[in-house]
């Protein structure tokens, strides 16, 4: 019962998390104009991963997409990639976890298969959450760097004649949505991995007994009766999980440095 609850809760938490990651990716408020030094402004700028927007004091808002692909900063492209990978992995994870749910019966699917699927979806959720958190954090770091660069250059270049504040950008709502959503997906993934342990049929430990038949000597060992849970010495299952680990590594194999122009 506790296993079903853990699995179900993990699924729901991951579902909310992935919905949040999708929402964050689509949101326009990744960076918003800093109004600290200029609270009364005729226009308010905010930017997303896909377009920039201007909201006027009249309430009118206009947005324009980033129609170029090559002209965009490498960091922005990297963030886009991380968020999309997170969404794709999360979506696949959700699909797998639906079939893995203990409360759903599909044909004569064994508990061992459900355990494997639960673990797979759990790993996918964890990687998905990490991708989202990484993407949002990279963008946040980019904002912080640019913010302080703007602050340093605020009154320069005009001989101190014009005391005007350069437009600076600070954290938008999408960043917080992304962090929370990534965290939820991560937690959901961990819960699925925990549930997987409970789903695996417990192995029965029998003592090795030797039966001496006339003319033949055959020893029966309990290893052959081990359930294929992936926690025993079953090499087939080990390979499945190794494959999963490789996928995780491949997902994270991005260039370590992104030049921001």
């Amino acid at each position: 019962m506790a296993v079903t609850a853990c699995q179900g809760l993990g699924f729901v938490v991951s579902l909310i998390g992935i919905a949040g990651i999708i929402a964050a990716t689509c949101m326009d408020q990744w960076s918003t104009q800093d109004l600290y030094n200029n609270p009364v402004t005729a226009v308010f700028n905010y930017q997303g991963l896909w377009r920039s927007c201007v909201r006027e004091s009249s309430g009118f808002t206009e947005c324009r997409g980033y129609f170029t692909l090559l002209g965009l900063p490498a960091m922005l492209q990297a963030v886009r990639a991380l968020m999309i990978v997170g969404i794709v992995l999360g979506a696949i994870g959700l699909l797998v976890s639906i079939f893995a749910l203990k409360c759903i019966r599909i044909g004569s699917m064994e508990d061992s298969a459900k355990a494997n699927m639960t673990l797979t979806s759990g790993i996918m959720f964890i990687v998905s959450g990490l991708c989202a958190i990484a993407g949002v954090s990279v963008f946040a770091n980019m904002l912080v760097t640019n913010f302080w660069m703007s602050t340093a250059n605020m009154y320069t270049g005009m001989g101190g004649m014009v005391q005007t504040v350069q437009t600076r950008y600070t954290f938008g709502a999408a960043l917080f949505v992304g962090w929370v959503a990534g965290g939820l997906t991560l937690i959901g993934g961990v819960m699925m991995c925990i549930a997987c342990r409970g789903l695996a049929p417990e192995e029965t430990n029998y003592k090795a007994v030797s039966y001496h038949a006339s003319g033949h000597s055959v020893a029966y060992k309990p290893g052959g009766f081990k359930a294929s849970t992936g926690f025993g010495s079953n090499t087939k299952n080990k390979k499945i999980y190794d494959g999963g680990a490789r996928t995780e590594d491949e997902v994270q194999s991005y260039p370590s440095k992104h030049d921001y122009v």
Epitope: Q33, T41, A42, V43, N45, S52, V54, E56, S57, S58, F60, E62, C63, R64, M158, V162, T164, V165, Q166, T167
Partner: antibody, heavy 119, light 111 residues
Framework: QEQLEESGGGLVKPGASLTLTCTAS?????????ISWVRQAPGKGLEWIAC???????TYYASWAKGRFTISKTSSTTVTLQMTSLTVADTATYFC????????????WGPGTLVTVSS | DVVMTQTPASVSEPVGGTVTIKCQAS??????LAWYQQKPGQPPKLLIY???TLASGVPSRFKGSGSGTEYTLTISGVQCADAATYYC?????????????FGGGTKVVVV
């Protein structure tokens, strides 16, 4: 005192190119403004050419100006208008104007610079 | 592009009278309209924006109204200083592709 000043006008031959510059003083284009170029032929009405939103360097042109005119923000105090393949019909006083938002209208204008296209 | 049609082309009014200038847009411009006053040898001066909001320093005898495609500028109690050419302009909306087209202008003569 916030001011705009146009420069780069003068006498040119048909087919020539010319770049007009709008220079800000007392404020900076690093802030968010809509800067437009407007022209007025002698004895005629006002004709809007192009606009740039300095916040993102978004640009927009009158349909007749596309291709021949290019508006751009070249520094935190200058916006330029590049004009190519000039004809006699382009003879006019060229103004640059600033709006605080697309909604607010152009509340700051330069005195204008005269461009004469003649052979 | 939006086409702004301004009427009449010229109007003559005695001091103290009322002048009404109409401006019609070829499509709805959602009250994104400005009115300007221009005197010979000078750049235009903003009078009204947002169809009805008076710009700072503009006398209250200037009044803007209208919505959709039909807009009006009314000058009540006309003074000699009001003799000028008046232009309506559709406000620039960059992303939606609405240009800042001007009307043909209305010359106001105060007699």
């Amino acid at each position: 005192q916030e001011q705009l000043e146009e420069s780069g006008g003068g006498l040119v031959k048909p087919g020539a190119s010319l770049t007009l510059t709008c220079t800000a003083s007392g404020f900076s284009f690093s802030n968010n403004y809509y800067i437009s170029w407007v022209r007025q032929a002698p004895g005629k009405g006002l004709e809007w050419i192009a606009c740039i939103y300095t916040g993102y360097s978004w640009t927009y042109y009158a349909s007749w100006a596309k291709g021949r005119f290019t508006i751009s923000k070249t520094s935190s105090t200058t916006v330029t208008l590049q004009m190519t393949s000039l004809t006699v019909a382009d003879t006019a006083t060229y103004f640059c104007a600033r709006a605080d938002s697309g909604y607010s209208g152009f509340n700051l204008w330069g005195p204008g610079t005269l461009v004469t296209v003649s052979s | 592009d939006v086409v702004m049609t301004q009427t009449p082309a010229s109007v003559s009014e005695p001091v103290g009278g009322t002048v009404t200038i109409k401006c019609q847009a070829s499509q709805s411009i959602d009250s994104r309209l400005a009115w300007y006053q221009q005197k010979p040898g000078q750049p235009p001066k903003l009078l009204i924006y947002g169809a009805s909001t008076l710009a700072s320093g503009v006398p209250s005898r200037f009044k803007g109204s209208g919505s959709g495609t039909e807009y009006t500028l009314t000058i009540s109690g006309v003074q000699c200083a009001d003799a000028a050419t008046y232009y309506c302009q559709c406000s620039v909306t960059i992303s939606t592709g609405v240009g800042g087209a001007f009307g043909g202008g209305t010359k106001v003569v105060v007699v």
